[in-house]
Every structure is written in structure tokens, then in C-alpha cells.
């Protein structure tokens, strides 16, 4: 019962997390105009991964898409890639986890298959969450760097017009949505992995039998016992986790292929 609850909760948490990642990716408020120097502006700027917007105090908002691919900063391309990879992995993970749910019966699917599917979806959720967190963090780092660069430009007198034209940007709502959503997906993935341990059927273990020889009191246990006990040191399961780690590395390094696009 606890396993089913853990699996179900993991699924729900991941579902909310992935919905949040999708929402964050689509949102326009990744960076918003810093109003510290001009709190009474009649024109408010904000930017997303796909377009930039200007909201006038008259109530009108105008958004323009980034219609160029080659002209965009490599970092922005990397963030886009990380978010998309996170969404794709999360979506596949959700699909897999639906079939893995203990409360859903599909034909004569064995518990071991469900356990493997639960583990697979869990790893996918973990990697998906990490991708989202990484993407948002890279963008946030970019913002912080640009913020302090533009602040330096304002106060070190790099030409009169630099100060007046430059618009400083700070963290937008999408960053916080992305961080929270990535965290939820990560937590959901961990819960799925934990549920997997309880789902896997314990192999029938022979009870240790003591053979008392005359003059000796040595206990003998069947040789294969330790190697076959559940998840104690199951190398098969370890490989799955290692595979997950490698997948995560591949996902993290994937966007760098597009750095020079």
C-alpha cells in the first residue's frame, strides 16, 4: 500500500513539475526590466526564450518573436535546448510511468516489468528536473552577469548615451516557476525510484540450514544466497543507475553542440 502511494504521489508530483517546466518554457517573463533606477517608467520590458515584449502603461502590450536562429546568443540556444530536452524526457517519463502504475492493470504485466518501468520513468524525471534546473540556472547566471555589466557601464561613464539607452533586466517569474517545477520533477523522480524498490518481487530465498558435524559447529549457508537477495548488491540495478548518470551527462553536454550555431 505504501509503495502504491509513493508511486502515485511520485507520478502526481512529476506531472505537476513537468506541467510547470512546460509553462516556464512558454512564459515571456524570463527576464523583466529592473525598475530600481526608474520606478515610474511608462514602458515596461520583459523577455522570454522565444520573444520579447513591451507593455506600455496605456495598457497595450507588443510582443516580437526572435525570428532569427543564427543571430541568437549561444547561451539562449543552450537554455532552450535544456528546457526542450527536459520536457521531452519528462513527457516520455510520464507515458512510461502511466503503464508502470501499480493501480493500473495492463494484461498480465509482471511486477518486475512494472518495477523496471517505474525505475526508468523515475530516472527520466530526475534527468528532466535537472535539465530544467540547469536551464533556468544558466539563464539566471547570464542575467546576473549582464546586470552587473550594465551597472558598471552606467557608473563608469562609458559614453553619455550608454547610460540612457541601456535597459537592465532582472529575474522574471518564469525563473522561479522553472526552479520550483524542476525541483518537483526531481522529487517525483526520486519517489518513483524509491517506489521501484518496493515493487520488485523478492526472490524466494532458501533459509539457512545448519549442518552439525561431529566435533564441529560450523554453519554452512547456500553459496548463491547473498548474490540473489533482492537489491542488496544487485549489479543489474547498479548498471541501470549508472546508465541514468551517463544519460544525465549526455543531456547536460548536449546543448554545447549548438554553441557555435
Amino acid at each position: 500500500m505504501a509503495v502504491t502511494a509513493c508511486q502515485g504521489l511520485g507520478f502526481v508530483v512529476s506531472l505537476i513539475g513537468i506541467a510547470g517546466i512546460i509553462a516556464a518554457t512558454c512564459m515571456d517573463q524570463w527576464s523583466t526590466q529592473d525598475l530600481y533606477n526608474n520606478p515610474v517608467t511608462a514602458v515596461f520590458n520583459y523577455q522570454g526564450l522565444w520573444r520579447s515584449c513591451v507593455r506600455e502603461s496605456s495598457g497595450f502590450t507588443e510582443c516580437r518573436g526572435y525570428f532569427t536562429l543564427l543571430g541568437l546568443p549561444a547561451m539562449l540556444q543552450a537554455v532552450r535546448a535544456l528546457m526542450i530536452v527536459g520536457i521531452v524526457l519528462g513527457a516520455i517519463g510520464l507515458l512510461v510511468s502511466i503503464f508502470a502504475l501499480k493501480c493500473i492493470r495492463i494484461g498480465s504485466m509482471e511486477d518486475s516489468a512494472k518495477a523496471n518501468m517505474t525505475l526508468t520513468s523515475g530516472i527520466m524525471f530526475i534527468v528532466s528536473g535537472l535539465c530544467a534546473i540547469a536551464g533556468v540556472s544558466v539563464f539566471a547566471n547570464m542575467l546576473v552577469t549582464n546586470f552587473w555589466m550594465s551597472t558598471a557601464n552606467m557608473y563608469t561613464g562609458m559614453g553619455g548615451m550608454v547610460q540612457t539607452v541601456q535597459t537592465r533586466y532582472t529575474f522574471g517569474a518564469a525563473l522561479f516557476v522553472g526552479w520550483v517545477a524542476g525541483g518537483l520533477t526531481l522529487i517525483g523522480g526520486v519517489m518513483m525510484c524509491i517506489a521501484c524498490r518496493g515493487l520488485a518481487p523478492e526472490e524466494t530465498n532458501y533459509k539457512a540450514v545448519s549442518y552439525h558435524a561431529s566435533g564441529h559447529s560450523v554453519a554452512y549457508k547456500p553459496g548463491g544466497f547473498k548474490a540473489s537477495t533482492g537489491f542488496g548488491s544487485n549489479t543489474k540495478n547498479k548498471k541501470i543507475y549508472d546508465g541514468g548518470a551517463r544519460t544525465e551527462d549526455e543531456v547536460q553536454s548536449y546543448p554545447s553542440k549548438h554553441d557555435y550555431v
Epitope: V40, A42, N45, E56, S57, S58, G59, F60, M161, T164
Partner: antibody, heavy 118, light 113 residues
Framework: QVQLVQSGAEVKKPGSSVKVSCKAS????????MNWVRQAPGQGLEWMGQ????????KYSGKFNSRVTITADKSTNTAYMELSSLRSEDTAVYYC???????????WGQGTLVTVSS | DIVLTQSPDSLAVSLGERATINCKSS????????????LTWYQQKPGQPPKLLIY???TRESGVPDRFSGSGSGTDFTLTISSLQAEDLAVYYC?????????FGQGTKLEIK
């Protein structure tokens, strides 16, 4: 077509208050900010403040902040500007003007002359 | 507050001639987000309310004759009437739409020479 019709001329004594109305027609009154601008005789234009009738949100010029109150009645599509503690230098023509795309004032009322005299 | 200074205060031009009015801002009116200058030009004829002529420094309002044009960016702007007509006798104002409080220039009175 868009029309802004203001109330008639007023003569007030110093220290009193005046309330000028501006009735809008021909557009969705609640969806556009309404500005109030004044013009003293032979002088330039001076922005006083604005209201968003949809939620009653207001913005005022610091010069008039303590003396001006801008309100709106959505049921009658009317905006109001009340100026208190009147002084002789408040003698001016008061205009209401719709705020539009580009942060411009695209339609103006005909103006209301307020004369402050003892 | 953004201060707009218009020059000259008054201008006398012959019919059919070019008239040029300048407006200088104490701060930039160029918005980096959309690269638009939030400067507006109005025409006010005697006894009438102001009329919108040009917004975003150079975009002509519909119905405004094409002899009116606006130019400039950042802090320096110009309103040009290419061929002055008798009905252009008016006071012209520039307005800041970039920052509160919304401010106007002191006005330039255009007269017929």
C-alpha cells in the same frame, strides 16, 4: 466614433473645490486610461494624472498629488477630476484625454474653463 | 522628471516654405525593448483642444497630412512641416510618453510670415 464631452465652465472662490466631469462614448470606457491635462491662459499643457476605470487604479503628478482626486463611474462612462484648495493660479482650461497605444492622448474633450476668483 | 525643451518658442514661416521645430529631452526617450522613441507631437489651434499628429517620434497618426513628419532619436527630436499651409497656424507641443510624470514641452507657436 469616440467622443469625450466635458461639463460646463465653473467660477470658484479660492480655497474651495471644483469637480469636472468627462463623459465618454464610442469605445469601451473601462479598458482605457483617462488622462487629465490642464492649460493656464496663454501657457502650455500640464499633465495632472490618470485613471484606469476598469479597476480604479490612478497615477498622479507629484505637483497635484495632495490636491487632486480622479475617479470614474463605469455605469455612466464618466470620469471625474476634483481639485481642492483652489488658488488663483489654478485658473485654467481642464481637458480629459484618452490614453492610447504608444502612450499617446489620441482623443481629447472640448475642455472646461475653471476660473478661480475672489 | 523628464524636461522637454522646445526651440524656437515662436516661428514665422512663409506659406509653402519648410518649418522645423525642435524638441530636446533631458533623458532618453528611446526604449531598448522595442527600439521605439516615446515622443509624441500635438497641434493645438486657437480655442481648440490639442490634436495628435505624430507618435513614436516618427509615426504619423491616421488622417494627418503627409507634409507633417517627425524624426530624431534618444534625446533630440524634430517636427518638420515640408510645405506650410494656412491651416497649420497653431502651437505645437512635444510630449514624453516614456516616464511618469508625463511631461510636455513649453510649446512652439507657428505663425505665417
Amino acid at each position: 466614433q469616440v467622443q469625450l464631452v466635458q461639463s460646463g465652465a465653473e467660477v470658484k472662490k479660492p480655497g474651495s473645490s471644483v469637480k469636472v466631469s468627462c463623459k465618454a462614448s464610442g469605445y469601451a470606457f473601462s479598458n482605457y486610461w483617462m488622462n487629465w491635462v490642464r492649460q493656464a491662459p496663454g501657457q502650455g499643457l500640464e499633465w495632472m494624472g490618470q485613471i484606469y476605470p476598469g479597476n480604479g487604479d490612478t497615477k498622479y503628478s507629484g505637483k497635484f498629488n495632495s490636491r487632486v482626486t480622479i475617479t470614474a463611474d463605469k455605469s455612466t462612462n464618466t470620469a471625474y477630476m476634483e481639485l481642492s484648495s483652489l488658488r488663483s493660479e489654478d485658473t485654467a482650461v481642464y481637458y480629459c484625454a484618452r490614453f492610447y497605444y504608444g502612450n499617446v492622448m489620441d482623443y481629447w474633450g472640448q475642455g472646461t474653463l475653471v476660473t478661480v476668483s475672489s | 522628471d523628464i524636461v522637454l525643451t522646445q526651440s524656437p518658442d515662436s516661428l514665422a514661416v512663409s506659406l509653402g516654405e519648410r518649418a522645423t521645430i525642435n524638441c530636446k529631452s533631458s533623458q532618453t526617450l528611446l526604449n531598448g525593448g522595442n527600439q521605439k522613441n516615446y515622443l509624441t507631437w500635438y497641434q493645438q489651434k486657437p480655442g481648440q483642444p490639442p490634436k495628435l499628429l505624430i507618435y513614436w517620434a516618427s509615426t504619423r497618426e491616421s488622417g494627418v497630412p503627409d507634409r507633417f513628419s517627425g524624426s530624431g532619436s534618444g534625446t533630440d527630436f524634430t517636427l518638420t512641416i515640408s510645405s506650410l499651409q494656412a491651416e497649420d497656424l497653431a502651437v505645437y507641443y512635444c510630449q514624453n510618453g516614456y516616464s511618469y510624470p508625463l511631461t510636455f514641452g513649453q510649446g512652439t507657436k507657428l505663425e505665417i510670415k
